[in-house]
């Protein structure tokens, strides 16, 4: 094939090689960019910056090599549009540093940075960690900091991510209250901080105030939906990112729902209880306290992480006619109590029949008198109470 005269030439089915000296100063308008999986760039002294816009449209890119060029700066968000990037070779350029944010979110199997005049600082603590943990093929490169010795020997005692402390109210929070949260940020080289409130939805009206190092957040007119929802404070510096999540407990009274008994590997009387703090539960059977045992007991389903409501069953493993009757679930917390009742019939009473019913016989009896007495079976009648904490 004739040699390719262009700055960048196709290489394989989805690759591009740009090796003609000094032909590029940016990566805009590369031919066939949207299908590229491999991009190889060499000897481009004028290519000094790599930014977000340079790699827009290269969504399929897996391997990026920029070597023996003039690269001085790679923007923290440069690879935002190349989430599939797995090999990145930036060796023999003019890079003094590379932000942790640049590689965040990528699953890099290989990162090559040898031959750059790296400057040892806390901003490269993440790279030192990669070297320590054997990630991305970094240890094999024996990276050096320009005039400072091996990256591995860089002192890192003071290289920490920000420290966060979120203050939440000590007192009980009621529905309709306003709640002030404060996030105190400490650390060197603080860059950015903020709140993540994605879980809150309609749980409160949100007002943010203040900035580094003290961020305020007012949650106005809170609802009970705020329970179990994360409110997250975050902060970043050149070493990395820190997040702290808190939850605000909004008190509200107990509530309870009962549903018709269902046969589900033996029997289940389904219930739902809600309340903050979590209510204690008590069952009554025909108005008397139900003593829970291994054959009649409360069983909860796995709770959803972001809600206070608990679902469960009163499990009846072998109910017979003696278990037929009225089941009441009592739920109580310091803010109120609730109850719900349901009739359950598991089995007909084999000892009960109506004297009016005809008795099927094969001959005429002399006497058709019949008696109907109490059932023979008696449950243990010792009145034990049972309390089950929910939550």
């Amino acid at each position: 094939a004739a040699p390719c005269p262009d700055a960048c030439c196709p290489h394989g089915s989805s690759g591009l090689r740009c090796t003609r000296d000094g032909a590029l100063d940016s990566l805009h308008h590369l031919p066939g960019a949207e299908n590229l999986t491999e991009l190889y760039i060499e000897n481009q002294q004028h290519l000094q910056h790599l930014e977000l816009r340079d790699l827009r449209g290269l969504g399929e890119l897996r391997n990026l090599t920029i070597v023996k060029s003039g690269l001085r700066f790679v923007a923290p968000d440069a690879f935002h549009f190349t989430p599939r990037l797995s090999r990145l070779n930036l060796s023999f350029n003019a890079l003094e540093s590379l932000s942790w944010k640049t590689v965040q979110g990528l699953s890099l199997q290989e990162l090559v940075l040898s031959g750059n005049p790296l400057h040892c600082s806390c901003a490269l603590r993440w790279l030192q960690r990669w070297e320590e943990e054997g990630l991305g093929g970094v240890p094999e490169q024996k990276l050096q900091c320009h005039g400072q010795g091996p990256l591995a020997h860089m002192p890192n005692a003071s290289c920490g991510v920000p420290t966060l402390k979120v203050q939440v109210p000590n007192a009980s929070v009621d529905v309709g209250d306003d709640v002030l949260l404060r996030c105190q940020v400490e650390g060197r080289g603080l860059e950015q901080a903020g709140w993540i409130l994605t879980e809150l939805e309609q749980s409160a009206t949100v007002m943010k105030s203040g900035g580094l190092p003290s961020l305020g957040l007012t949650l106005a007119n809170v609802t009970s939906d705020l329970n179990r929802k994360n409110v997250t404070c975050w902060a970043e510096n050149d070493v990395g990112r820190a997040e702290v999540s808190v939850q605000v407990n909004v008190s509200f009274p107990a509530s309870v729902q009962l549903h018709t008994a269902v046969e589900m590997h033996h029997w289940c009387i389904p219930f739902s209880v809600d309340g903050q703090p979590a209510p204690s539960l008590r069952w009554l059977f025909n108005g008397s306290v139900l003593n829970e045992t291994s054959f009649i007991f409360t069983e909860f389903l796995e709770p959803a992480a972001n809600e206070t409501v608990r679902h469960g069953c009163l499990r009846l493993n072998q109910p017979t006619h003696v278990n037929n009757g009225n089941y009441t679930l009592l739920a109580a917390n310091p803010f109120g109590q609730a109850s719900a009742s349901i009739m359950a019939a598991f089995m007909d009473n084999p000892f009960e029949f109506n004297p009016e019913d005809p008795i099927p016989v094969s001959f005429s009896p002399v006497d058709t008198n019949s008696t109907s007495g109490d059932p023979v079976e008696k449950k243990d009648e010792t009145p034990f109470g049972v309390s089950v904490a929910v939550g």
């Epitope: 291994s294 007991f297 089995m347 079976e377």
Partner: antibody
Framework: QVQLVQSGAEVKKPGASVKVSCKSS????????MHWVRQAPGQGLEWIGE????????NYNEKFKNRATLTVDISISTAYMELSRLRSDDTAVYYC??????????WGQGTTVTVSS | EVVLTQSPATLSLSPGERATLSCSAS?????MHWYQQKPGQAPRRWIY???KLASGVPARFSGSGSGTDYTLTISSLEPEDAAVYFC?????????FGQGTRLEIK
């Protein structure tokens, strides 16, 4: 697979106490009731009591109510049965067994407790 | 408490014969459960909920009954069926066991 592994044999003097452990593995400990059953030499099975690790609920056989104590440590998935004021007729093999929806589906290997002066 | 009485105390039969073990309750129970125990071993759940065979139990075993009278039947005895069989109720506290039936194979 489900395993209930009990502590080793014990020899005790009358009036002493014994604490038998039952370490569970292979299932969610808190979802099952744990029963304790004993069997004197050449005799039948006698139920001591049951405990629900999920909430600590305990039911005892009235016969053992004042002498037996059932406890659990959910952090190590272990149930315990302590029997106090031992008498010679407490000499027996003590078993733990688990149940959820069906009775005593798996048993420990048993712990021999000998009470002798 | 519900007292369970098993009969006979000992049953001695030859291989291939049919064995019938009975368990009578002092008051009505919803279901009966059976355990097999061999010397030096822990009991094993054998039949539960009156008639369900536990995992690994041969089909020659069956269970039946209701109210106060329950039966474990072995249709055709095999030598490995020699053991003590206990019935148990799980309907009221305290849980109780029968005194056991020793099945011997001649």
């Amino acid at each position: 697979q489900v395993q209930l592994v009990q502590s080793g044999a014990e020899v005790k003097k009358p009036g002493a106490s014994v604490k038998v452990s039952c370490k569970s593995s292979g299932y969610t400990f808190t979802n099952y009731w744990m029963h304790w059953v004993r069997q004197a030499p050449g005799q039948g099975l006698e139920w001591i009591g049951e405990i629900y690790p999920n909430n600590g609920r305990v039911n005892y056989n009235e016969k053992f109510k004042n002498r037996a104590t059932l406890t659990v440590d959910i952090s190590i998935s272990t149930a315990y049965m302590e029997l106090s004021r031992l008498r010679s007729d407490d000499t027996a093999v003590y078993y733990c067994a688990r149940s959820r929806y069906d009775p005593m589906e798996d048993w420990g290997q048993g712990t021999t407790v000998t009470v002798s002066s | 408490e519900v007292v369970l009485t098993q009969s006979p105390a000992t049953l001695s039969l030859s291989p291939g014969e049919r064995a019938t073990l009975s368990c009578s309750a002092s008051s009505s129970v919803g279901y009966m459960h059976w355990y097999q125990q061999k010397p030096g071993q822990a009991p094993r759940r054998w039949i539960y909920d009156t008639s369900k065979l536990a995992s690994g139990v041969p089909a020659r075993f069956s269970g039946s009954g209701s109210g106060t009278d329950y039966t474990l039947t072995i249709s055709s005895l095999e030598p490995e069926d020699a053991a003590v069989y206990f019935c148990q109720q799980w309907s009221s506290i305290p849980l109780t066991f029968g005194q056991g039936t020793r099945l011997e194979i001649k």
